[in-house]
């Protein structure tokens, strides 16, 4: 989290972000919340990153002011319009790349000062894992895919029975580069294993860590995954 | 409500110009994309540009460039199409939509009823 | 430029079955594809944006699948109304590209 005042001027405003990461080929949010004000038409917000001519975004009276816009994020951007009032400044990016990363400031105008603060964007890809039994394997396997990570991830197993256990002797991880020649599809294997077990795949990158678990007994198959985004800190 | 019309049918000779309207009700005209789509009679959809009324900037279909014109006049909420050195295989029906996300180019959510325009000596 | 490449080019189907339309991207790798009907005459009609988002008042009989550059459109239980053509539109780019289109015909 990074919270941010205004230096210059008689007041000083409250700018909040948050850190963040995008997932290209999709939307990202660019979080920033500020001091509300009561009329919008006094709200001035500019979206600026380093590195960058143009404005990422400007929204003043009441409505997007493009004429500053750098080319590169063209027809890329929106603020939520109707959220704006009550402090929301949070930026919405269409099609993120793994050039969208940088630093980004939101800076903030209204009738009781000026306030920013910076915002570091990370891009890369991350998707949830899906682990299944592998049942065309010889003996008992486990097959854990994930289908698009960027930078290249490290890949863990574990286990609730054997906690501790080091799996890397009965498992063999592959990265299969897929068709935009970025993004890559991750493929686990784990053999040998138990039934009555719990077995977890973890997915990490700097971006991002997700586990997917299984539960296999005699009688059934249990799944689930979650995805955590890393360093999502406040400014 | 948003509400897109559209001119009415036009019929060109080969070699000629044609503009086509699209007037905008119902939302902030500056603050929206419009795109502008063409269908041949019995074919399928073609994108051929969109612009951003409040700035004027455009996105053209590389088919198109050099041929295709557009414009939005703010004043009165319309955005044209202009296509000039027409042929026959430009007879089709030009559809006016406006793109969802605000400034952000989205989908085609809003489309005007179409204006068709037949090129025939 | 990114082309689109929808098929089949038309499908004959019976009401209540399950009908499955494809839309392949020549390139990328993004969410940003839309579904539209079109019936003889009018103007198409957004289904589905962002891959599986559901326009507001669309039937939950339609629905939208995808990732990477394969996507589909799953008419769960055809009704007589939705027989139509419909269009894949990918809109991620700079640059538009709509598929050529699936008719949708009565068996």
């Known amino acids: 989290l990074i919270i941010g005042f205004g230096i210059s001027g008689r007041h000083s405003i409250t700018v909040t972000t948050v850190a963040s990461a995008g997932n290209i080929g999709e939307d990202g949010i660019l979080s920033c919340t500020f001091e509300p004000d009561i009329k919008l038409s006094d709200i001035v917000i500019q979206w600026l990153k380093e590195g960058v001519l143009g404005l990422v975004h400007e929204f003043k009276e009441g409505k997007d002011e493009l004429s500053e816009q750098d080319e590169m994020f063209r027809g890329r951007t929106a603020v939520f319009a109707d959220q704006v009032i009550v402090g929301n400044a949070s930026l919405r990016l269409k099609n993120v790349q793994l050039t969208d990363a940088g630093t980004y400031k939101c800076y903030i105008i209204t009738s009781k000062g000026k306030g920013n603060a910076n915002l570091e964007y990370k891009t890369g890809a991350f998707s949830m894992p899906e682990v299944n039994v592998d049942y065309n394997a010889s003996s008992e396997t486990l097959r854990c895919e994930a289908p698009r990570w960027f930078p290249q991830p490290t890949v863990v197993w574990a286990s609730q029975v054997d906690q501790g256990a080091n799996f890397s002797e009965v498992s063999n991880t592959s990265f299969e580069l897929n068709s935009e020649n970025v993004t890559m599809k991750v493929v686990s294997v784990l053999y040998n294993v138990t039934i009555n077990n719990t077995y977890s795949c973890m997915i990490e990158n700097d971006i991002a860590k997700a586990t997917g678990d299984i539960k296999v007994t005699e009688s059934e198959i249990k799944r689930r995954s979650h995805l955590q985004l890393l360093n999502s800190k406040a400014s | 409500e948003v509400q897109l019309v559209q001119s009415g049918a036009e019929v060109k000779k080969p070699g000629a110009s044609v503009k086509v309207s699209c007037k905008a009700s119902g939302y902030t005209f500056t603050s929206y994309w419009i795109g502008w789509v063409r269908q041949a009679p019995g074919q399928g959809l073609e994108w051929i540009g969109d612009i951003y009324p409040g700035g004027g900037y455009t996105n053209y279909n590389e088919k198109f460039k050099g041929r295709a014109t557009l414009t939005a006049d703010t004043s009165t909420s319309t955005a044209y199409l202009e296509l000039s050195s027409l042929r026959s295989e430009d007879t089709a029906v030009y559809y006016c939509?406006?793109?969802?996300?605000?400034?952000?180019?989205?989908?085609?959510?809003?489309w005007g009823q179409g204006t068709l325009v037949t090129v025939s000596s | 430029d990114i082309q689109m490449t929808q098929s089949p080019s038309s499908l004959s189907a019976s009401v209540g079955d399950r009908v499955t339309i494809t839309c392949k991207a020549s390139q990328g790798f993004n969410k940003y594809v839309a579904w539209y009907q079109q019936k003889p005459g009018k103007a198409p009609k957004l289904l589905i944006h962002y891959t599986s988002t559901l326009q507001p008042g669309v039937p939950s009989r339609f629905s939208g699948s995808g990732s990477g550059t394969d996507f589909t459109l799953t008419i769960s239980s055809l009704q007589p109304e939705d027989f139509a053509t419909y269009y894949c539109l990918q809109y991620g780019n700079l640059l538009y590209a709509f598929g050529q289109g699936t008719k949708v015909e009565i068996k």
């Open positions: 939509a406006r793109l969802d996300g605000s400034s952000y180019r989205g989908a085609m959510d809003s």
